[in-house]
Interface confidence: medium
């Protein structure tokens, strides 16, 4: 239901009160007129015009009220109209970066492919918090997600794809460490862990993008 | 409620293929990956893989790769596992069951392999 | 792969007494633990995830702790019900591997 549309039930409900009010009180005086009318019925009828009478100033405060929060939202509104949103659809914001969860399951060559289509890299890692976001992001799913890291060989330090060293403070990479892959070694998160991989397996992925945070 | 309903009991010969499904009851099939599960009294319980049946996208341990094939027919929220060239070792009782973790389980299905 | 080992395949209780059954993981799993109670004939049933949270319907008798590689499941004033086989599983990473079974039995 639309603010507007809350607006109209206020203002009829309104209007039904002040009906309801011009009623009673020509309830009362009828009854003062009559000699068979009690005094104790008569209490009774005031008692309900003045609560009547406090839901209609309160009734009316409740339309100020939706009346001021209508104009700060068509406000608001038309700021965020102003706005692209940080990220594309299906796109998770968090920080300054979008994530995409893939559903394809792909070598990891083809997944940073996937991710090159769609203007973005493969996931990076750079902090601790990251690590907590992605980490809470698949705690549900059972499966292993690529992510941007590879290396050589086991003689070869872990590299993300721009190049950059993994910072050994953020995680230890389990598994296949000590292995030598023709097709290289690359690293998966799943669920709580980082681990070392054949990267011609296929398994799912995280592509991360810069989120566009400037106004227009 | 959330119900798994597992199809027969099964006797097969060496060699064949059989194809036991999974029916899901009482919750959004495709919003849960389904799991498989293998039991015998020599290995235990032993999991076999798993599909999530919005994408399709599935995991198995390395030792059924090629022995069992998961897929999921989201019309009819049914589950399936087929489990390929047959022998002894395949006999067992095999559990559907939806994760996170494995909160409901089918009744089992038992497989007997046998000429 | 990561092993699962609980150390007694078989425990004998008196009724009303206190069971405690370990699990041993060959690697840490950062609490990522299950345990799983199965009656004869039927299939397992999950009583604790997380290695901590009693599942809904799960008398409170039953409690789970631990942290690394070690994890306990403990029964408190133990009942005829509880007579069952248990089973932990780690499900950090696959393959999810299951404990060999502790089989419980009253005295």
């Known amino acids: 239901m639309q603010l507007s549309q809350v607006s109209d039930l206020l203002t009829q409900e309104q209007a039904n009160l002040t009906h309801q009010k011009k009623k009673l009180e020509g309830q009362i005086s009828a009854r003062q007129q009559a000699e068979e009318a009690s005094q104790e019925s008569e209490n009774e009828l005031k008692e309900m015009i003045e609560t009547l009478a406090r839901k209609l100033n309160e009734k009316s405060k409740e339309q100020m009220e939706l009346h001021h929060q209508n104009l700060n939202l068509q406000e608001t509104l038309k700021r965020v109209a102003n706005c692209s949103a940080p990220c594309p659809q299906d796109w998770i914001w968090h920080g300054e970066n979008c994530y995409l969860f893939s559903s394809g399951s792909f070598n990891w060559e083809k997944s940073q492919e996937k991710c090159l289509s769609l203007d973005a890299k493969l996931l990076k890692i750079n902090s601790t918090a990251d690590l907590d976001f992605i980490q809470q992001a698949i705690s549900y799913s059972s499966f292993p997600f690529w992510m941007g890291l590879s290396r050589r060989n086991p003689s070869y330090p872990w590299l993300w794809e721009d190049g950059s060293p993994l910072m050994p403070h953020l995680f230890r990479v389990r598994g296949a460490v000590s292995q030598t892959y023709p097709s290289g070694t690359c690293a998966y998160i799943q669920r709580g862990a980082v681990y070392a991989e054949n990267c011609i397996l296929a398994a799912f992925s995280i592509c991360q993008k810069k989120a566009n945070l400037r106004a227009q | 409620q959330v119900q798994l309903q597992q199809s027969g009991a099964e006797l097969v010969r060496p060699g064949a293929s059989v194809k036991l499904s999974c029916k899901a009851l009482?919750?959004?099939?495709?919003?849960?990956?389904m799991h498989w599960v293998k039991q015998t009294p020599v290995h235990g319980l032993e999991w076999i893989g798993a599909?999530?049946?919005?994408?399709?996208?599935?995991a198995y341990i390395q030792k059924f790769k090629g022995k069992a094939t998961l897929t999921a027919d989201k019309s009819s929220s049914t589950a399936h596992m087929e489990l390929s060239s047959l022998t002894s070792e395949d006999s067992a009782v095999y559990y559907c069951?939806?994760?996170?973790?494995?909160?409901?389980w089918g009744q089992g299905t038992s497989v007997t392999v046998s000429s | 792969d990561i092993q699962m080992t609980q150390s007694s395949s078989y425990l004998s209780v008196s009724l009303g007494g206190r069971v405690t059954i370990t699990c041993k993981a060959s690697d840490h799993i950062n609490n990522w633990l299950a345990w799983y109670q199965q009656k004869p004939g039927n299939a397992p049933r999950l009583l604790i995830s997380?290695?901590?949270s009693l599942e809904t319907g799960v008398p409170s008798r039953f409690s789970g702790s631990g942290s690394g590689k070690d994890y306990t499941l403990s029964i408190t004033g133990l009942q005829t019900e509880d007579v069952a086989t248990y089973y932990c599983q780690q499900y950090l990473i696959t393959p999810y591997t299951f404990g060999g079974g502790t089989k419980l039995e009253i005295k």
């Open positions: 009482g919750y959004t099939f495709t919003d849960y990956e």
């Open positions: 997380g290695a901590t």
């Open positions: 599909i999530h049946p919005g994408s399709g996208g599935a």
């Open positions: 069951t939806r994760w996170l973790p494995m909160d409901y």
